[in-house]
């Protein structure tokens, strides 16, 4: 067959699998006169064979592993054995069987983890060569675990990459494992070719022997420290370790005071820099951080609580510079005339805030010393020896000595002697009649004025009238108001009235005395009045149980999945209509009659969340009013953003040729939600090919740095292949590419010729 | 798509009853909420009744509440109004109409042609 098995000799490249034996010819080159013979040089290994008549073909199974291109020359001859045509390559690639097996590096491994540590972030790297072709299924490892001892309850503590053989915990093993219980594990881990997809794959297995450690980056106990320290400060309190040393400490102040007065050392002890007061404040929290050496948590950050403990420095203080004080002219030996109340800032029910009373001077002392006793602990005065006169002596003064168990302090009582409280206040009508009014009639309105009279001294306790609704008012709609001046009532709404629930109320007023009455005398009907208030109806707006409602659903739900319901009431009765507004995403849709509220598209956390929409509820037939809500959908975060690298990389390059092995560091992100301690990426080179050249490792959760293997390469672009991977549940992988290039440099930027001026790189390695 | 047929309109005494049938085909299956609506002469449409089509939850326009019933047979994919104690001011064309998806009332998307009811004195 011309052109397929025979023709001219020309160069050609033949592909052929590995491990066949020879089953036909390769080719027939044809001669052109003068030539008569053919003659194949170049790297046969004694397997390619040339016949005189121009027959190439192969005399046994080729093998990849030992030589993956044969590079070949055929030349054409005349009858005196001189080239006249050629030679010309002949390339024979030989194409990949799986004849290999994986085969672990180390027959067993042993590493440690320490409890707690983050989950997938890994502690060992099991590590496997397969002879076979990387960039074939034939060469593709699959990593897993094939049993862990011990399990308990089931449960894998450990995890491993199936692509890179990263052995981390799991969240379980993250949480469980404890050095206590169980202080080591064996794992058996397999390795398959084929990327572990095949029945044909093979595999080996190698044993990993792990220890767990103890995690010392533990929480300390609660610290406590007396106030006013007179010691030199700074004063270590406590401390924390990380559980290697170079961590890097630092405290957070949740709280963000004006004045934080804590610090921490590298060492991880923390200290109180200045004297605390326990009166400005009586505890602290706070978090201490231990960072790597790129500013990277380790892990998530302790909490540190330290109460401060109160020393006595603080004097009893007097409620006011003079506390006033009435009492009657007949009252009674024992009655109380009223309560001293001192303060302490000290802290209180202890012995630094715990106050005494003692009267140390009466003036004037008529008709005697002594006419008054204080109840030591209580504060209380009370009328000690005889009933007083006002027309002897009107006025008394107390000072009263208030001490805790270090301070004392005077304060000052004034007693007035007013007249003896035998006058009933008496209301000058009994009923107010009725009264009308809209249910929306407006807070703080005054609806009605009342007035009573005492014929008892002007201005003091047993003439002052206080009015109380002692009936028809339990939800305390209404209250009064009293003028000092002339004990007139002023009758307020004080809560919205509600044609609902209470369209006529029967209002009934008493009129009092703060003083009590004289022994004998009662209060009568005189004290007392009523009056109707009538509330008419106003249509009012539909009322939400809730002015927020907040759902939480996963950002994946399936479309249609119910994500939320609301529920308004018609203060009417009237049955209502529920829409949504501001839907900008078109996300949702609402069950008017219900309320219930579903989506009707993908959700994606990513684009904002909250989701904030509004909900209207609206009567139905009636005046139509409507009411506006907020519905908060909260979508929780799905693994759903592969790794991308966090900017252009465009424009990077390497003089040429290379002096010196050269490397570039690049950062990765993407869109999930990451907690506390920010993401954390793994980095391996996208394909297997690079690996000659170029070499990947990881500085921390989010950068990487790329480092040439040698210094041989050629002065054009490079385009380098980088696979991301983000270790989440599932775990997503992005391959992302850098493109470098190898220039010829002109102090230190690449030079190109006039007319080569596109596409220059602008970031020299 | 849903197509809608209505049934059962007609002539009425005042006080009188009327019940009102309406068939739902095609992707019934996608109902959010069923309702009736009524137009009388010279006036603007108007909700009656509505329903949730899987909690069967309803809804009244103030004029009929107590008076019109809506209900739906999930099996028979129809949605019915029972009419009582009718006055003249309920005559109308009354239309059935479903609704899949949206924000309100007013994105009722599939509509029947209409049943005239009448109501005399």
């Known amino acids: 067959q011309e052109g397929k098995f025979s023709g001219p000799l020309k160069p050609m490249t033949f592909s052929i699998y590995e491990g066949q034996e020879p089953s036909q010819i390769i080719f027939q080159f044809k001669a052109n006169p003068p030539a008569v013979t053919f003659e194949l040089t170049g790297e046969t290994d004694n397997i390619f064979v040339i016949e005189r008549e121009g027959l190439l073909y192969y005399n046994r199974a080729l093998d990849r592993e030992t030589r993956s291109t044969h590079n070949l020359q055929v030349a054409a001859l005349d009858a005196n054995g001189i080239i006249v045509e050629g030679p010309v390559p002949i390339t024979i690639k030989v194409k990949d069987i799986n004849d290999n097996r994986p085969t672990f590096l180390q027959s067993k491994y042993e590493g440690s983890v320490r409890q707690n540590s983050r989950p997938g972030k890994p502690f060992l790297y099991v590590n496997a060569t397969d002879l076979d072709d990387p960039a074939t299924p034939n060469g593709q490892l699959y990593y897993q675990i094939v049993i862990q001892l011990p399990m308990i309850n089931n449960v894998m503590y450990f995890q491993i990459n199936n692509k890179t053989g990263a052995i981390s915990l799991t969240r379980e093993g993250s949480q469980e494992l404890n050095p206590a219980k169980n202080p080591s594990y064996n794992l058996v881990i397999s390795v398959k070719d084929m990327g572990g997809q095949s029945e044909n794959s093979f595999s080996d297995t190698t044993s990993v022997d792990i220890i767990v450690t103890e995690n010392i980056w533990k929480a300390p106990k609660p610290v406590e420290m007396v106030e006013n320290s007179t010691d030199p400060h700074p004063i270590k309190i406590t401390q924390v370790r990380w559980n290697d040393p170079g961590a890097q400490y630092s405290l957070v102040d949740k709280e963000k005071l004006p004045r934080f007065p804590f610090s921490i050392d590298q060492e991880g002890d923390i200290y109180v820099t200045q004297p605390l007061d326990r009166e400005e404040k009586d505890a602290y929290v706070f978090y201490a951080v231990a960072k790597d050496e790129y500013g990277k948590p380790l892990s998530y950050p302790l909490e540190i609580h330290v109460k401060v403990k109160d020393i006595n420095d603080n004097p009893p203080t007097c409620p006011s510079p003079v506390t006033v004080f009435e009492v009657q002219e007949n009252e009674r030996l024992g009655n109380s005339i009223g309560t001293l109340t001192a303060h302490d800032r000290d802290e209180e029910n202890t012995a630094n805030s715990f106050l005494n009373y003692r009267i140390v001077e009466q003036t004037p002392k008529l008709p005697m010393d002594g006419l008054f006793l204080i109840q030591t602990y209580a504060g209380m005065l009370q009328l000690a020896k005889q009933s007083l006169k006002k027309q002897d002596t009107p006025q008394y003064n107390l000072t009263i000595e208030v001490s805790d168990k270090d301070f004392k302090t005077l304060c000052f009582v004034q007693i007035n002697v007013i007249d003896i409280n035998d006058q009933i206040p008496i209301f000058e009508k009994s009923d107010y009649g009725n009264l009308t009014l809209a249910e929306d009639t407006n807070i703080g309105s005054t609806i009605l004025t009342i007035q009573a009279t005492d014929a008892d001294e002007p201005f003091t306790g047993s003439s002052k009238i206080l009015y109380h609704i002692i009936k028809g008012d339990s939800e305390g709609r209404l209250g009064v108001d009293t003028d000092p001046h002339t004990n007139t009532g002023y009758v307020i709404i004080k809560k919205p009235l509600d044609f609902e629930t209470a369209a006529v109320s029967n209002i009934v007023f008493k009129a009092e005395n703060p003083e009590p009455l004289v022994f004998g005398v009662k209060y009568n009907a005189s004290s007392f009045a009523k009056f109707t208030l009538i509330v008419t109806d106003v249509n009012e707006a539909p009322q939400f149980s809730q002015h927020v409602f907040q759902a939480k659903v996963s950002e994946d739900v399936a479309i249609g999945t119910k994500v939320g319901n609301v529920t308004a009431k018609d203060p009417e009765g009237l049955d209502i209509s529920y829409s949504l507004r501001g839907d900008t995403r078109g996300w949702l849709k609402i069950d008017h009659v219900t309320g219930e509220i579903f989506s009707v598209a993908p959700l994606d956390r990513e684009a904002g969340s909250p989701y904030r929409v509004q909900v209207v509820a609206t009567e139905v037939g009636g005046s139509s009013l409507s009411s506006v809500s907020e519905f908060h959908l909260i979508l929780m975060d799905v693994n759903d953003n592969p790794p991308r690298l966090a900017k252009d990389y465009t424009g990077l390059f390497f003089c040429h040729p290379l002096s010196a092995p050269g490397s570039l560091i690049f950062e990765a992100t993407d869109d999930d939600q990451h907690l506390f301690r920010g993401p954390h990426f793994t980095f391996s080179l996208g394909s297997g090919s690079l690996q000659n050249d170029w070499e990947v490792s990881k500085i921390n959760g989010t950068h990487a740095r790329l480092s040439t293997r040698h210094t041989e390469f050629e002065e054009r672009e490079y385009v380098v292949l980088i696979r991301i991977n983000d270790g989440g549940r599932p775990p997503l992988e992005g391959i992302v590419s850098l493109p470098v290039t190898f220039c010829s440099c002109v102090e230190g930027s690449c030079f190109r010729p006039a007319g080569h001026q596109t596409g220059i790189p602008t970031v020299g390695m | 798509e849903v197509q809608l047929v209505e049934s059962g309109g007609g002539l009425v005494q005042a006080g009188g009853s009327l019940r009102l049938a309406c068939a739902a085909s095609?992707?019934?299956?996608?109902?959010?909420?069923m309702g009736w609506f009524r137009q009388a002469p010279g006036k603007e449409r108007e909700i009656v009744a509505a329903?949730?089509?899987?909690?069967?939850?309803?809804i009244y326009t103030a004029s009929v509440k107590g008076r019109f019933t809506i209900s739906r047979d999930k099996s028979k994919n129809t949605l019915y109004l029972q009419m009582s104690s009718l006055k003249p001011e309920d005559t109308a064309v009354y239309y059935c109409?479903?609704?899949?998806?949206?924000?309100?009332?007013?994105?009722?998307?599939?509509w029947g042609q209409g049943t005239q009811v009448t109501v005399s004195s």
């Open positions: 095609g992707r019934t299956d996608s109902i959010l909420n």
């Open positions: 329903i949730s089509w899987f909690r069967g939850e309803t």
């Open positions: 109409a479903a609704r899949n998806g949206g924000y309100d009332l007013n994105d009722y998307a599939y």
